[in-house]
Interface confidence: low
């Protein structure tokens, strides 16, 4: 049951907090939380890398031409992230959600 | 189909605290990626945006405005309210809310408007 | 705050004319630009979003184009209804728009 809320919240939650936090002013912990989730679980957005399309800070001037951070990159250097190509960006099918179900159900289970 | 509709006082004078209301229906606010602004038009002049608020209560403002406006909403009851503090003739417009879908085709467009309603400032 | 201009702020037109509305923004918005079309005690009605897009039921004689700092808004095959103000706006950062076109007839 737990697995289950936990599992749900996360479904609802990490697209808002990628899309509305990301890289905004006062979330500078979430914002280095969602850039260690892509590097350590190999991933990118929260469904999958188009996500990053309704951001507010790729949205804006800030991102200097990204279309997505640079943590989703497989090799991280500075504006990496201005292509979103699958040479060297995470394109996991179901993204980040994917990733983190998998990591909950072996870990708390 | 997605409707919203402004109500205010009509009339009111300088010094005093204006308050608008926007009622909507054919969407909610506590769905994830819905918005709704709050944007003014004096009479044969072009639009500000006042006020934005989110689904979570998060809030953006006008940074030349900012002291004066509060936004809020009663998502139960599908409204969004606004305060203007402090009125001046200046403030005499068209106020207009509309919605902003974060997460759909339309990106942070305004895709819905409400019809407006006339706000004058006078002594 | 990004400031969006609108350099004509009339336009003389003719049925079936091709016309364009130009919009520059002060700083790179990317594509994060929508068009909207207001007639005389109408609400604002939008007609293009990210730069180049058309709104469900806009006509196809609408297209948006640009990207970065310059957009353009083009009337393929001006038609009497059309006559109308035209507003740029940005929503890279907190929205802003432009002062306003307005056709008008020759």
């Known amino acids: 049951a737990y697995y289950q809320q936990l599992n749900t919240e996360l479904k609802e939650n990490l697209k808002d907090t990628m899309t509305k936090r990301y890289h905004q002013p006062g979330h500078e912990a979430v914002t280095s939380a969602v850039d260690q989730l892509q590097q350590e679980f190999h991933c990118c957005g929260s469904n999958n890398s188009q996500d990053w399309r309704d951001s507010e800070w790729i949205r804006s001037q800030e991102a200097g031409g990204r279309v997505v951070p640079d943590s989703c990159c497989k090799t991280v250097v500075a504006l990496c992230g201005q292509r979103d190509h699958a040479s060297n960006i995470y394109k996991v099918e179901g993204g980040c959600i994917t990733k983190l179900e998998t990591f909950i159900q072996e870990h708390l289970r | 189909q997605v409707t919203l509709k402004e109500s205010g006082p009509g009339i009111l004078q300088p010094s005093q605290t204006l308050s608008l209301t926007c009622s909507f229906s054919g969407f909610t606010l506590s769905t994830s990626g819905m918005g709704v602004s709050w944007i003014r038009q004096p009479s044969g002049k072009g639009l500000e945006w006042l006020a934005h608020i989110y689904w979570d209560d998060d809030k953006r403002y006008n940074p030349s405005l900012k002291s004066r406006l509060t936004i809020s909403k009663d998502t139960s009851r599908n409204q969004v309210f606004l305060k203007i503090t402090s009125v001046d003739t200046a403030d005499t417009a068209t106020y207009y809310c509309?919605?902003?879908?974060?997460?759909?085709?339309?990106?942070?467009?305004?895709?819905?408007w409400g019809q407006g309603t006339s706000v004058t400032v006078s002594s | 705050d990004i400031v969006m201009t609108q350099s004509q702020k009339f336009m003389s037109t003719s049925e079936g004319d091709r016309v364009s509305i130009t919009c520059k923004a002060s700083?790179?918005?990317?594509?994060?630009v929508a068009w909207y079309q207001q007639k005389p005690g109408q609400s604002p009605k939008l007609l293009i979003y990210s730069a180049s897009n058309r709104y469900t039921g806009v006509p196809d004689r609408f297209t948006g184009s640009g990207s970065g700092t310059d957009f353009t808004l083009t009337i393929s095959n001006m038609q009497s209804e059309d006559l109308a103000d035209y507003f740029c706006q940005q929503y890279s950062s907190n929205p802003t728009f432009g002062a306003g076109t307005k056709l008008e007839l020759k």
């Open positions: 509309a919605r902003r879908d974060h997460y759909g085709d339309y990106s942070y467009a305004m895709d819905y």
């Open positions: 700083q790179n918005v990317g594509i994060a």
